[in-house]
């Protein structure tokens, strides 16, 4: 499973210090370049959950692989979904957090709920403020059950969820009706693809048994463990206040892990850190109880002792979950929990154990997959321990899996599981790119998709003329920089391609594609000047300019003119394609522009040094902007938009434009014509119920006039501000909790 | 699309019983409160009784109560009116109703109505 | 219980015209009411719930207003399709009652 963490601070005596911090442990996280892993992503999801709106939440990358949401200046901002995605590519996941209110009417007695396919599942919501009202439950925001208050047992509402898959799982909650549904009990329900102790297409493979509350991952069958715990099987434990798969993270603050909750990728949802309970997590463990949510009973023997946050501590002579081998037993000692190797390559593996009698070659054994078991070839004997040392055969992908160290001696056997994943080595899938080229360089990006593994850790590029049979140039590179290949011929083909290398012995994939690549011809040297130029109409300009008289034949094949629109922040380009012009018609221009005016000569894909620039301004056209644009929602699909004339008009009004955008929406905008320009309103419809619009709208006369003013409107729908119950539609039935 | 169909009218003496039956398609029966409401000839609309989806809550009319009895079935989509003691008031329409998916906001789906004649 | 009384009785309207049916609760049901409208051998119709919130394909011209004890249902501009009896029900409480009916004539 990919190591991403979302920690929220629950110390919620004053809301703005509450924060939100999402960790990946990640190679290479957050590094924000498309071939080398996304940003992490940290944002409240508003999809079913929506609080009013306030100021926005502040974001804070610390470094490469942290981010931190701030802002929060009241209670009700703090309650909804929470989620942090990171990982690259297949490896993409997403972390969810769900918060709810410490004052709400209902509260979760478990927030998180992982269950397995087929299972029953129960999410119980405690009556903290009473109401003789129905309780409604909802299911990722729509309808899905209804109690009656009288329902109640022992305090509580009970949604029993039989036979659950995979489909069922998300938010549920619970509502008293007519309440704010801030004050809601809010769930998260996430249902494994598999029975229970299963994964895999077809559920056809075992987990390996995930120790300390782990959660065995339906689709890759590795165990998500608990904050706090570390391993194949989640069986080491971190040292106190530390997390993440590796134990690399530690708590912030000086009271370690107390008052966060953790959230890990699916299966394994949200819990407290090792040795801390309770609803906000500032509960230690009772004796005798350790782990996550002090879900684990330590049941030491043999005079161990619970630790809360690793369990049983055992004395010396002793060893195992419970205190319970003896040290007499032979025991596998400091194994890895994860292995790994490039493709094709034949790694040694080393197995220490220790015992009494002592371990020696022939008593440890090596066990791959398949089920084939290999001997070692030679053994380092210690005072304490023997390290036995295994040749593998050639590895293949089949080998990837849990690979078994076995020691048997008189006094008993051990066995220590371990991951061996087999990674191939990456393969260019496309050539690599040209960013710019010149008489004697090319500028290329190496950064291509590859099939096989990451990360890159060496990126070679190998270059020779084309058709030529000499030796490959090769040049190291890093991985996320641009690489300018020097001292090449003007106007000659080069032959590019990009060979990638990961980690590890072996780690050296194929050569990618060959690209063909040409150098550019010589530079052009000249700098024209502007000999003038002049309006011809709103959106027409005339323009001259001259070039320096030099002996010899001219280098260049046209001329570039430039206009630069400082105010919109827009650059036009006008190619003239005959190096004999001297002047050139500009049309299509914006009317009352102040445009900045250059000419360049260019000689291939080249260009030569631009004129000193010019600064003209078109005359304005168009009628002024329409005035006191106003926006009113009528219905979950209409809103009525109401103006006055422009002022001072030069001649009558052909009709206005509107331009109708969602509010953050990212898709182009809609215009719409008012053919009656009498009219001071209009209604727009046909608009999606719930959803925020921005309209601006201006006028025509010959040409279109200045735009008025931006507002915004939402359509009605299911909103806090309702006092009664939402709307039944379809938008009703599967509704938001506004 | 959600329907509703009501069996089990018909005549029969005062004080004596029938069992009114609504066979529920289209959506998810086990989830939604249920409701009987009656029209007796030329008179306006009566509610008659309402159970919640677990089938452990009823509520019913003060005219009916003790002689009607509100019962579901949700493996069967059914739900079911028992009526014993039966009144010449009794006489009506009787429709089977799901309420809105938001639980206490009206009654959204109706069925068509079977008729009670209570008459000797 | 809560009664529920409707006015007027009988309400006779032009196709065109605006028809404005009140009805009154004997006590305060917030804005938990809804409208129904039924036509004999139908089965009934819900319009309005919440007090103002239109149902699902119910047309614009009917709209409701009102919260408290004081609801009122009106119908912008009456068509032919639109006669029949209004009932207006509150659902604050149990049980829940309907009031006694508007009917509406074509004029």
């Known amino acids: 499973a990919v190591d991403l963490t979302l920690l929220a601070n629950l110390r919620l005596t004053d809301p703005q210090r509450f924060f939100l911090t999402c960790v990946s442990g990640e190679a290479g996280a957050g590094r924000g370049s498309d071939a080398w892993g996304p940003p992490l992503l940290l944002e409240k999801d508003d999809r079913i959950v929506r609080t009013p709106p306030g100021p926005p939440l502040r974001l804070a990358r610390n470094g490469s692989h942290q981010v931190t949401l701030r802002g929060f200046s009241k209670p009700s901002d703090l309650v909804g979904v929470f989620s942090c995605v990171g990982g690259a590519g297949a490896r993409r996941t997403r972390v969810i957090y769900v918060h709810n209110s410490p004052g709400a009417h209902l509260l979760p007695d478990k927030v998180t709920h992982t269950v397995n396919k087929g299972d029953t599942a129960v999410l119980s919501a405690r009556v903290h403020k009473e109401k003789q009202t129905d309780v409604i439950w909802k299911s990722n925001g729509s309808y899905f059950y209804t109690l009656d208050w009288h329902e109640a047992q022992d305090g509580r509402f009970l949604l029993q969820l039989p036979n659950v898959q995979p489909p069922s799982s998300g938010i549920y909650s619970a509502t008293y009706l007519e309440a704010s549904p801030l004050g809601s009990a809010f769930f998260r329900l996430i249902v494994r693809g598999c029975g229970a102790g299963r994964w895999g297409p077809g559920c056809t493979k075992e987990c390996p048994g995930c120790l300390h509350g782990g959660v065995c991952h339906d689709h890759d069958g590795e165990c998500v463990c608990p904050p706090g715990f570390t391993g194949t099987r989640c069986e080491q434990a971190c040292r106190e206040g530390r997390f993440g798969q590796s134990c690399q993270e530690q708590c912030p603050g000086i009271s370690g892990c107390r008052g966060l909750t953790f959230c890990l990728p699916d299966p394994y949802g949200c819990s407290c850190g090792s040795g801390w309970r309770g609803s906000q997590c500032q509960e230690a463990c009772a004796p005798g109880h350790f782990g996550a949510d002090c879900r684990l009973q330590c049941q030491c023997q043999n005079g161990g002792t619970c630790d809360r946050f690793s369990g049983c501590v055992c004395p010396s002579g002793w060893h195992g979950v419970h205190c319970e081998k003896s040290d007499r037993i032979p025991q596998i000692l400091n194994m890895a929990s994860e292995l790994e190797f490039n493709l094709e390559t034949m790694p040694r593996i080393n197995c220490a154990a220790a015992g009494n009698p002592f371990p020696v070659r022939g008593s440890i054994e090596l066990r791959k997959p398949d089920g084939t078991v290999l001997l070692s070839t030679k053994a380092i004997v210690e005072p304490e321990k023997t390290t036995a040392e295994f040749e593998v055969p050639r590895l293949v992908l089949a080998d990837s899996g849990f690979w078994e160290c076995r020691v048997s001696t008189s006094g008993g056997q051990d066995s220590r599981r371990f991951k061996v994943n087999v990674k191939v080595p990456p393969v260019p899938l496309a050539a690599p790119r040209l960013l710019t080229k010149q008489s004697r360089q090319l500028v290329v990006s190496p950064l291509v998709s590859f099939s096989g593994d990451g990360p890159i850790s060496t990126v070679r590029l190998h270059y020779r003329p084309q058709d030529s049979t000499m030796d490959w140039s090769t040049i190291v590179v890093d991985p996320s920089e641009n690489v300018t290949l020097m001292n090449l011929r003007p106007k000659t083909g080069y032959s590019v391609r990009v060979q990638l290398s990961r980690p590890g012995e072996g780690g050296e994939g194929a050569w990618g594609p060959p690209t063909l690549m040409t150098t550019d011809c010589p530079e052009p040297l000249l700098q024209p000047w502007l000999e003038g130029w002049h309006v011809e109409g709103t959106d027409r300009l005339r323009v001259s300019w001259s070039l320096p008289l030099v002996p010899g034949p001219l280098v260049g094949d046209g001329f570039l003119l430039r206009l630069w629109d400082g105010t919109r922040g827009q650059e036009r380009r006008e190619n003239v394609s005959s190096p004999q012009a001297r002047t050139a018609l500009l049309t299509g221009l914006t009317p009352g522009t102040h445009y900045q005016l250059d000419v360049q000569l260019y000689h291939c894909t080249l260009l030569g040094p631009a004129s000193p620039p010019a600064h003209v301004l078109l005359p304005p056209s168009g009628p002024p902007a329409p005035r006191h644009l106003h926006a009113q929602a009528l219905s979950d699909s209409e809103i009525q938009l109401t103006w006055k004339h422009p002022e001072a008009l030069p001649g009558p009004i052909s009709k206005y434009v509107v331009e109708v955008q969602v509010a953050g929406g990212a898709g182009d905008p809609l215009w719409i014509d008012v053919d009656r320009p009498e009219e001071t309103s209009t209604i727009i419809r046909g608009l999606n119920a719930s959803t925020r619009y921005l309209f601006r709208m201006r006028a025509s006369i010959q040409g279109l006039g200045d735009w008025s003013n931006t507002v915004e409107e939402s359509t009605l729908g299911n909103g806090l501000q309702a006092e009664g119950p939402v709307q039944e539609s379809r938008a009703a039935e599967e509704g938001l909790d506004q | 699309e959600v329907q509703l169909l009501e069996s089990g009218g018909g005549l029969v003496q005062p004080g004596g019983s029938l069992r009114l039956s609504c066979a529920a398609s289209?959506?998810?029966?086990?989830?939604?409160?249920m409701a009987w409401v009656r029209q007796a000839p030329g008179k306006g609309l009566e509610w008659v009784s309402s159970?919640?989806?677990?089938?452990?809550?009823?509520y019913y009319a003060d005219s009916v109560k003790g002689r009607f009895t509100i019962s579901r079935d949700n493996s069967k989509n059914t739900l079911y009116l028992q009526m014993n003691s039966l009144r010449a008031e009794d006489t009506a329409v009787y429709y089977c109703?799901?309420?809105?998916?938001?639980?206490?906001?009206?009654?959204?789906?109706w069925g068509q109505g079977t008729l009670v004649t209570v008459s000797s | 219980d809560i009664q529920m009384t409707q006015s007027p009785a009988t309400l006779s309207v032009s196709p065109g015209e605006r028809a404005t049916l009140s009805c009154r609760a004997s006590?305060?049901?917030?804005?938990?009411l809804a409208w129904y409208q039924h036509k004999p051998g139908q089965a009934p119709r819900l319009l309005i719930y919440?007090?103002?919130i239109r149902a699902t394909g119910i047309p614009a011209r009917f709209s409701g207003s009102g919260s408290g004890t004081e609801f009122t249902l009106t119908i912008s501009s009456l068509q032919s399709e639109d006669f029949g009896v209004y009932y207006c029900?509150?659902?604050?409480?149990?049980?829940?009652?309907f009031g006694q009916g508007t009917k509406v004539e074509i004029k």
């Open positions: 109703a799901r309420d809105l998916s938001i639980a206490a906001a009206g009654t959204a789906y």
């Open positions: 289209g959506f998810t029966f086990s989830r939604y409160r």
């Open positions: 159970i919640y989806p677990s089938g452990g809550v009823t």
């Open positions: 006590q305060s049901v917030s804005s938990n």
């Open positions: 919440g007090a103002s």
């Open positions: 029900q509150q659902y604050k409480d149990w049980p829940r009652t």
